[in-house]
Interface confidence: low
């Protein structure tokens, strides 16, 4: 279920799957929610630790049991991912942090009159992930009212420093507030060039596009279909970026599909989940559990309820069925995508709906057990 | 909202505008989306106008002037007014609206979390009231959704300011001693929300107050935590299962 409580002065021991710098616990929790394996997180505010390297540290954690031992650490904040929390799942983060400088690659500097205007500029710049703004009272006069637009390889700051009269924040593109607008078109038989930032396996171009939309550095993508001539590249989704923000070239190519991230769409973003079920397809991955259920929809529900499950395969092979129930294979991987996709099988596959924000399974408060 | 500022897109995605279409169409009250098919508002919004088919509920909007005849709206399937609400009193000023069709959630249209039943221990320090209501006592409905940060006031303090009315434990008050910031006419039914541990909760429903933003006259709100049993009972009996974001 959905667990929203935060634990003050507590730090989860072990289970680390990733670490980064974030300005507060809520942003750390959001990164945990969107990380394919993160179930728990711990955050170290600047006040909680003397080690400059660990200040603002956000530690994403996984656990087979869904929990980890808590150790007392003054000032630390820990909590759960919001993976099963329905409408609370959002990559939108509006807060502005005063007295904090979020470091990254500064690619644009301009003079603006307010931090809100700086945030707007970041939101309206295709490459900007976060920003810092030097206020009117900044100690160096020549930097006052400077708006620095930034990006980093992981989409989070490479460091966070306490600095007076500086305010920082994130792009509001995930809030669907970008003025850039987006290309909804999918281009059949076209491959984009430029830099690959990641490679995942997906069953179709639409899943590829959604993954691109929620990847911090993906601006466009190319997907190789299951009939692509090179077998090892079938169902490969290449997430791409470029200096200009658009593909520098595109090549006509049979059995490829290309398109753009939808992060810059106005008013609507795709949900960060994939609800379609793929008949005759087997998703490979690490086995989490196998259970007998009645129907592929129940299999998907079972996967959704098991928080670590990322995708599933429902087998219809006679040896995998007992009366009306068949085997539901609950699976996971390092990146949340299948490690292999096989066609022509007797069964169906799909993804967990744990990141769908329309779920009614969500609650907003701490779970309390009845006596 | 008196003393407020413009909101931005998606800042308060649970805020809805309750409008009546008679000869003309106008905004009457606010409300809060609490589930795909449920809106929580003030009972007094329906005083004299309990006809379901004249109401139009607009969600996912920021600017009332953007509403055209083509703007999608929700219609009411059922109005559930608290059984103990009386027109002449301030008590039990709470109502549920069941929409005819469920709404999809987006960044601009999603529900607000409800508090735990009888939530008395949480100390809320970051509370906001939102609405399209008057910006001064004899003002007019605002186009852009307004927001204002207002501190909660203890019921004892509130009772001192309203000696002619009973401030019950099922009410919550908010305001500045010096006035200047408050809800006003047309904000009724809208949310008083507080952020706690990074999460917004619906603490109150805008109900009443002496004038607007007057010195030592806080706004009075229906305390949602006190009505959690009622909300759950009504939404579950109507649906078979709870359709709003509430404690497990």
């Amino acid at each position: 279920g959905c667990l929203t409580q935060l634990y003050e002065n507590a730090f989860f021991r072990g289970g680390d799957v990733a670490s980064m710098y974030t300005p507060n616990a809520q942003y750390c929790q959001m990164r945990c929610t969107f990380h394919p394996r993160c179930l728990l997180f711990s955050f170290l505010p600047a006040s909680s630790i003397n080690d400059m390297e660990k200040r603002f540290g956000c530690f994403l954690k996984d656990s087979v049991t869904g929990t980890l031992p808590k150790v007392h650490r003054t000032g630390a904040v820990s909590g759960h991912s919001l993976k099963q929390c329905g409408h609370q799942i959002s990559a939108c983060h509006r807060d502005i942090y005063k007295g904090v400088d979020m470091r990254g690659v500064n690619f644009n500097v301009s003079k603006v009159s307010s931090v809100e205007e700086c945030q707007k500029r970041c939101t309206s710049n295709i490459r900007c992930q976060f920003f810092s703004y030097a206020t009117q009272t900044f100690h160096k006069a020549e930097y006052r009212n400077n708006c620095l637009l930034k990006y980093s390889p992981g989409g989070t700051p490479t460091a966070i420093k306490v600095l007076s009269n500086v305010e920082s924040g994130f792009s509001l593109k995930p809030c669907a507030l970008s003025e850039i607008g987006c290309h909804m078109n999918i281009f059949q038989h076209l491959a984009f060039s430029d830099v690959d930032v990641a490679r995942v396996l997906t069953p179709d171009a639409f899943v590829c596009r959604t993954i691109c939309t929620y990847h911090p550095n993906c601006l466009f993508f190319t997907f190789y279909t299951n009939v692509w001539k090179i077998e090892s590249q079938r169902n490969v989704c290449l997430l791409k970026t470029s200096e200009s923000g658009t593909p520098s070239s595109s090549t006509p190519q049979e059995n490829t599909i290309s398109g753009y991230s939808l992060l810059t769409c106005k008013r609507t973003l795709p949900e960060p989940c994939h609800s379609k079920i793929y008949p005759g397809v087997d998703f490979g991955g690490e086995e989490l559990n196998v259970t007998f259920v009645k129907g592929v929809n129940v299999c998907q529900e079972t996967c959704t309820k098991m928080i670590r499950c990322q995708f599933f395969t429902y087998s219809l092979l006679p040896e995998d069925c007992k009366e009306e129930k068949c085997k539901c294979f609950l699976r996971l991987s390092m990146d949340g995508s299948p490690t292999r996709i096989a066609y022509g099988t007797q069964g169906s596959s799909g993804y967990s709906l744990r990141l769908c924000n329309t779920g009614d399974n969500s609650v907003c408060t701490t779970k309390t057990s009845t006596r | 909202i008196v003393g407020g500022t413009n909101s931005s897109w998606g800042e308060w995605p649970w805020q809805v505008s309750l409008q009546v279409k008679l000869t003309a169409q106008r905004h009457l009250c606010g409300g809060s989306l609490i589930g795909h098919q449920w809106v929580l508002t003030a009972a007094h919004c329906f005083d004299g106008l309990p006809l379901q088919d004249v109401w139009r509920i607009y969600s996912g909007i920021l600017n009332l002037s953007d509403i055209t005849k083509d703007t999608p709206f929700s219609q009411i399937k059922e109005i559930i007014i608290h059984q103990n609400y009386k027109v002449s009193e301030g008590n039990h000023d709470i109502a549920l609206i069941k929409l005819q069709a469920p709404l999809n959630y987006t960044e601009f249209q999603k529900p607000i979390c409800l508090p735990s039943k009888g939530d008395t221990s949480t100390i809320y320090t970051n509370c906001w009231v939102t609405g399209w209501g008057f910006s001064k006592e004899k003002g007019e409905i605002q186009n852009i959704l307004q927001k204002v940060n207002i501190p909660l006031v203890t019921n004892e303090e509130c009772q001192k300011r309203y000696q002619d009315y009973k401030i019950t434990q099922r009410m919550v008050c908010a305001g500045y001693k010096e006035g200047g910031k408050d809800a006003c006419k047309g904000d009724s039914g809208g949310p008083l929300v507080c952020k706690h541990n990074g999460m917004w909760r619906l603490v109150g429903i805008t109900s009443w107050g002496e004038g607007c933003a007057r010195r030592e006259q806080p706004g009075v709100y229906t305390k949602v935590a006190e009505y959690m049993d009622w909300i759950l009972e009504k939404t579950q009996s109507s649906d078979g299962k709870a359709q709003m974001q509430s404690p497990a």
Epitope: - | D47, G48, V87, G90, E140, D164, C184, K185, G219
Partner: antibody, heavy 122, light 106 residues
């Protein structure tokens, strides 16, 4: 802008009838207690009749009970006063007004129209 | 029915004077009392409600006090614009007006 506009006044003979209207605009008419108040030439204000928001409850001053009927059409934002068996002492400027009830709601305040003159004379 | 008795019925005063008008209810009306100002040929204008709460936009020289059966309207320093007739009104049980107090130039 909030407005109340009375109409229907005029000269009528004793025993005659008249129907006053009050057109409301700029506020949520259906939410308010509406009332009629009159003022005889050179005299004070006298409350005549009131009607609650839904129209289900109507109240009258003793001086007009049984002769006057107050009603409202919320769909037309209009208040009415049907005056039958008129007497010379009913001669007055008739104002429509609305005012708060119970707790001061976030949508209640006090407004008067400019009045319409009714003269009952043979 | 609740009767409202206002006194005096006429009051002569000069600009700058402090003026007090009283209103007595035939039974307790708590604080459910309003004061209105009316100028010839015009509709009444609300000054004070709930006995002592100043209506928005009304000058602070006007104040109200009292509860139960005895109420007072005070104008701390009479201005030329204040020469008019003043009415009290109870709204505890339906509505009743006092007979009015005319404030005229001395």
């Amino acid at each position: 802008e909030v407005q109340l506009l009375e109409s229907g006044g005029g000269l009528v003979q004793p025993g005659g009838s008249l129907r006053l209207s009050c057109a409301a605009s700029g506020f949520t008419f259906s939410h308010y207690i509406m009332m009629w108040v009159r003022q005889a030439p050179g005299k004070g204000l006298e409350w005549v009749s009131g009607i609650y928001s839904s129209g289900g409850i109507t109240v009258y001053a003793d001086s007009v009970k049984g002769r006057f009927t107050i009603s409202r059409d919320n769909s037309k934002n209009t208040l009415y006063l049907q005056m039958n068996s008129l007497r010379a002492e009913d001669t007055a400027v008739y104002y429509c007004a609305y005012r708060r009830i119970g707790v001061p709601r976030r949508d209640s305040f006090d407004i008067w129209g400019q009045g319409t003159m009714v003269t009952v004379s043979s | 029915d609740i009767q409202m008795t206002q006194s005096p019925s006429t009051l002569s005063a000069s600009v700058g004077d402090r003026v007090t008008i009283t209103c007595r209810a035939s039974q307790s009306i708590s604080s459910w009392l309003a004061w209105y100002q009316q100028k010839p040929g015009k509709a009444p204008n609300l000054l004070i409600y709930k006995a002592s709460t100043l209506e928005s936009g009304v000058p602070s020289r006007f104040s109200g006090s009292g509860s139960g059966t005895e109420f007072t309207l005070t104008i701390s320093s009479l201005q030329p614009d204040d020469f008019a007739t003043y009415y009290c009104q109870q709204y505890n049980t339906y509505w009743t007006f006092g007979q009015g107090t005319k404030v005229e130039i001395k």
